[in-house]
């Protein structure tokens, strides 16, 4: 009879064990364990009848298709075998054990006691067959095993071979190299690789296999296992395999598909190919005169680009447009995208106009092309070039006029200051009374007319001022303070201010320049009670043109001492300080009580202590501060009243040989003009030089050289 055993372990004993077994008995035990296990069988006791080749009684161990062992007897001899310590191991998960006894037993035999158990199969060690073993890595576990792949590989659906994902390779560069996966190591199994070369239309792909070519093949059948196929449009080249690479292939197409197939076996190193785009050839190029083409090649093909550039001082000219470089390209039909442009000499064109300046050409025919030279100069004697610049400009390769110091910036013509077109009289002889000024003697003299239309009737007054630059007038703050009902210091509205320059005779304003004010700036600390800081500026709406009758006065150096005592200075004015003369009479010039023609007077600077004392001795609260100085004569004389408020008290500076504004007509004592010891009080301009420059928005260094030569 047959006994079916399915447990993972168990015991098998001869019938009647441990008593002797019966005669003429046959029992089969079929042991089945799960897949992935084998069966181990060993005997703890064995005692059967001995016979030649175990013909009588025996224990036979077998699988489905093979006898693993036959045991009988008690001891192993030449012709019979006992299990002893031997272990029988099934190759698979099934084992059949058959016990048979014949019809007679001469002795009493006790039979056998056997044990079996399921033991794990280590498939990773035991699988020799390539068809069944893992391609890359094998992992054993009790009852089974599994395969895995190296990085970058994917386990095939057969759960054994390792393939790669290589169906999405796109090449768009004009040259490239394509290889089988992992080249030059053996390529992966069970893979379908697809490589697409997609170039711009107009190119043709040329393929060349290189180095090693090793694809699994077959001696009789062409490429049944692994192969390369090349697809060009509808046409398929290949399959290719073996160890001999195909000849170079000219596809005549811009689009190529390369298919590589590998099956689940074999160890071959694969392949490598390079591809190159070929295109139509374009005609030879000649560089333009005064130019070059880059890169310079013997031949140019489709998509090659060249850059046309010109020598220094020349510009590329294409369709009347100037440019630095021009690019042309070889087209797919073998023609160039454009004609070669020409190189034209750079032209800086007409140089920019210089305000208050002139231009002279150093090059013949007034040329304005590359390396031509021009010279800017200022309208002398009224303007002088800032920083003594040469004024020489050369036409640069960039097409701009360039100066070594200023670059492309134009020079600046600054107004010359303190140099009247007529020289002022010698200061040797003392002039006590006022005298007529010749035109151009005081070219900085300004008449400031203020008409406050916010009052009814309109309030009108005037003062004098001194031109500092083409746009700025220096004057006294009290002239430009709004005549408010309280003591607040607010400048008059700029709309209410008119400035006359180049005015000689108030009856004839036709030759004068009149200008509106753009800004009125009073010194922030001007004190209406004692006239301390009595200084202000007017910015003109438009810069005035300078000339013989309109020129600035120089500002002094910053020096708190101010002008030295006894120095002689000049003050000019129209004698309008006469309190009995109304402004309307001045403006209309219809009265003979004032001087129509500009007057001037020469006055000495009075020592500060003397002036201070003279005012302290008077009734009234007079204060001669450090921001003021006095001028006039002890014995008096009407001359001290000449000059309008805000007018310049100028002193000749020996160092710079220029006239410098040291004072501004500010105030005087309560007595009649010309009274004894009534000195005129002037704002000390040298205390305010920084403030003036700051308001005018000019760094001091710009104008300082005008005074200190």
């Amino acid at each position: 009879h047959t006994v079916e055993l399915n447990n993972m372990f168990g015991q098998i004993q001869s019938p009647g064990y441990p008593d002797s077994y019966p005669s003429d008995s046959e029992v089969t035990w079929n042991i089945t364990v799960p897949d992935g296990f084998r069966i181990k069988l060993y005997f703890m006791h064995f005692n059967l009848e001995s016979s030649y080749l175990c013909e009588y009684d025996y224990v036979k161990v077998e699988t489905e298709d093979q006898v693993l062992a036959t045991f009988c007897g008690r001891e192993t001899t030449d012709t019979e075998q006992t299990p002893g310590q031997e272990v029988v191991l099934s190759p698979g998960s099934f084992m059949s054990i058959t016990f048979r006894s014949d019809f007679s037993n001469e002795e009493r035999f006790t039979g056998f006691d056997a044990h079996y158990m399921a033991v794990d199969v280590d498939e990773c060690k035991e699988r020799e067959d390539e068809e069944l073993s893992c391609d890359h890595y094998c992992h054993n576990y009790i009852g089974g095993y599994y395969c895995s792949c190296r990085f970058g590989y994917i386990l095939h659906t057969d759960n054994r071979t390792c393939r790669v994902e290589c169906s999405d390779n796109l090449f768009t560069q004009r040259t490239g190299v394509i290889t089988s996966p992992d080249f030059p190591n053996p390529y992966p199994k069970s893979s379908e690789c697809l490589y697409t070369i997609e170039l711009e239309e107009g190119f043709m792909v040329n393929l060349q296999f290189e180095d090693i070519f090793d694809i699994e093949d077959h001696p009789e059948v062409p490429c049944p296992y692994d192969y390369i196929k090349i697809k060009v449009g509808p046409k398929v080249l290949g399959p290719f395999c073996g160890e001999k690479a195909p000849e170079p292939i000219s596809t005549q197409s811009h689009s190529v598909l390369i298919l590589f197939h590998s099956d689940n076996s074999g160890e071959n190193r694969g392949w490598r190919l390079s591809y190159r785009a070929a295109g139509n050839e374009c005609p030879e190029l000649q560089p333009p005169v005064h130019g070059k083409i880059e890169p310079s090649q013997a031949k140019y093909f489709f998509k090659d680009q060249v850059l046309v550039s010109c020598d220094t001082g020349y510009k590329v000219l294409k369709d009347n447009v100037e440019m630095d470089t021009f690019q042309i390209e070889c087209l797919k039909d073998g023609t160039w995208s454009n004609k070669i442009p020409t190189c034209k000499i750079v032209d800086c064109r007409a140089p920019g106009e210089l305000e208050h300046g002139l231009i002279t050409f150093s090059t013949r025919n007034n040329l304005t092309t590359y390396k031509s030279e021009i010279k800017y100069s200022c309208q002398e004697p009224y303007y002088k070039m800032l920083n003594n610049n040469t004024g020489i400009y050369t036409c640069s390769a960039q097409g701009v006029w360039m100066n070594k110091v200023l670059g492309r910036s134009l020079p600046t013509c600054l107004p010359e200051c303190g140099q009247p077109s007529r020289s002022l009289p010698s200061l040797v002889k003392r002039i006590i009374g006022g005298r007529n000024a010749e035109p151009g003697l005081f070219p900085w003299q300004a008449l400031i007319v203020v008409e406050d239309t916010s009052r009814v009737p309109n309030d009108k007054w005037f003062g004098s001022g001194a031109l500092l630059s083409a746009s700025w007038i220096l004057t006294a703050a009290h002239v430009l303070r709004s005549q408010r009902r309280d003591t607040t210091v607010i400048p008059v509205s700029k709309e209410h201010v008119t400035v006359y320059l180049g005015l000689h005779d108030v009856r004839d304003k036709s030759g004068a320049v009149n200008s509106s004010a753009a800004r009125v700036v009073l010194h922030p600390d001007f004190n209406i009670q004692n006239y301390n800081h009595d200084i202000a500026l007017v910015q003109l709406q438009e810069p005035v043109p300078l000339g013989p009758h309109v020129m600035p006065v120089c500002l002094p150096r910053l020096e708190p001492e101010g002008p030295a005592p006894h120095m002689l200075g000049l003050v000019a004015g129209w004698g309008i300080s006469n309190p009995n003369v109304t402004v309307d009479e001045i403006i209309s010039s219809g009265t003979r009580t004032l001087s129509d023609v500009l007057q001037y007077v020469k006055l000495p600077v009075v020592p500060h202590a003397e002036c201070k004392t003279s005012y302290e001795s008077r009734s009234g609260n007079y204060s001669v501060t450090e921001n003021m100085f006095c001028a006039g004569y002890y014995e008096g004389g009407k001359d001290t009243c000449l000059g309008d408020s805000g007018g310049a008290f100028v002193i000749f500076d020996d160092l710079s040989q220029r006239w410098v504004v040291q004072g501004l007509v500010s105030w005087g004592g309560p007595e009649e003009c010309g009274s004894k010891q009534v000195y005129g009080v002037y704002t000390k301009v040298s205390n305010y030089v920084d403030w003036v420059w700051e308001q005018m928005g000019l760094p001091q260094s710009v104008v300082e050289p005008q005074v200190e030569r």
């Epitope: 239309t453 916010s454 009052r455 009814v456 009737p457 309030d459 009108k460 007054w461 003062g463 009290h478 002239v479 303070r481 005549q483 009902r485 309280d486 003591t487 607010i490 309190p579 003369v581 109304t582 402004v583 408020s645 105030w667």
Partner: antibody, heavy 113, light 112 residues
Framework: EVQLQQSGAELVKPGASVKISCKAS????????IEWVKQRPGHGLEWIGE????????DYNERFKDKATFTADTSSNTAYMQLTSLTPDDSATYYC??????WGSGTTLTVSS | DVVMTQTPSSLAVSAGEKVTMSCKSS????????????LAWYQQKPGQSPKLLIY???TRESGVPDRFTGSGSGTDFTLTISSVQAEDLAIYYC????????FGGGTKLEIK
């Protein structure tokens, strides 16, 4: 014709406020000062202050600094004077004046409980 | 504040007579910048608003009869009516605007 038209008479209680208006016509309102003057019977004329409508600049008599506030609406060419914390002493005729030369008709203010 | 003193406080004259009235200021009204004297004369007729007669001490306002004359300088000023008319019945005020304006107490002119 240049004119200054003032608002009508006011009767208000002590402690209250009042705003008197002065509408200008016939000239450029923004460019001329408007002055305000108080007249009480037997007390003569008192200058309160002035406003330049275009810029909003003001000058005040120190005595009226806490009493009067000037404003101007250039879109309607009207100047205003607001008087606050009124007492019977504020009862008077108030004139607006175009910078000295032209006087309004006056607004009579009576402060009485 | 500049104090303005008017004299007499009232006077009565017959039509056709010349009349003068005085106004004194506590300080000079001459502005050294504008060179003007900021003194004005006003006429206020009964029940009417004041009216400008003279400004800058001596300039007659347009439309004012030439019988009205302003004079004076510094601190002493005079308004003269050369030939008084019945319609000149009014109170006359002087006003300074050299600083924050102040008015004189007024001179009442009555016609006999």
């Amino acid at each position: 014709e240049v004119q200054l038209q003032q608002s009508g008479a006011e009767l208000v209680k002590p402690g209250a406020s009042v705003k008197i208006s002065c509408k200008a016509s016939g000239y450029t309102f923004t460019g001329k000062w408007i002055e305000w003057v108080k007249q009480r019977p037997g007390h003569g004329l008192e200058w309160i202050g002035e406003i330049l409508p275009g810029s909003g600049s003001t000058d005040y008599n120190e005595r009226f600094k806490d009493k009067a506030t000037f404003t101007a609406d250039t879109s309607s060419n009207t100047a205003y004077m607001q008087l606050t914390s009124l007492t019977p002493d504020d009862s008077a005729t108030y004139y607006c004046v175009r910078s000295e030369d032209l006087w309004g008709s006056g607004t009579t203010l009576t402060v009485s409980s | 504040d500049v104090v303005m003193t008017q004299t007499p406080s009232s006077l009565a004259v017959s039509a056709g007579e010349k009349v003068t009235m005085s106004c004194k200021s506590s300080q000079s009204l001459l502005n050294s910048v504008t060179r003007k004297t900021y003194l004005a004369w006003y006429q206020q007729k009964p029940g009417q608003s004041p009216k400008l007669l003279i400004y800058w001490a001596s300039t007659r306002e347009s439309g004012v009869p030439d019988r009205f004359t302003g004079s004076g300088s510094g601190t002493d000023f005079t308004l003269t009516i050369s030939s008084v008319q019945a319609e000149d019945l009014a109170i006359y005020y002087c006003k300074q605007s050299y600083t924050l304006p102040t008015f004189g107490g007024g001179t009442k002119l009555e016609i006999k």
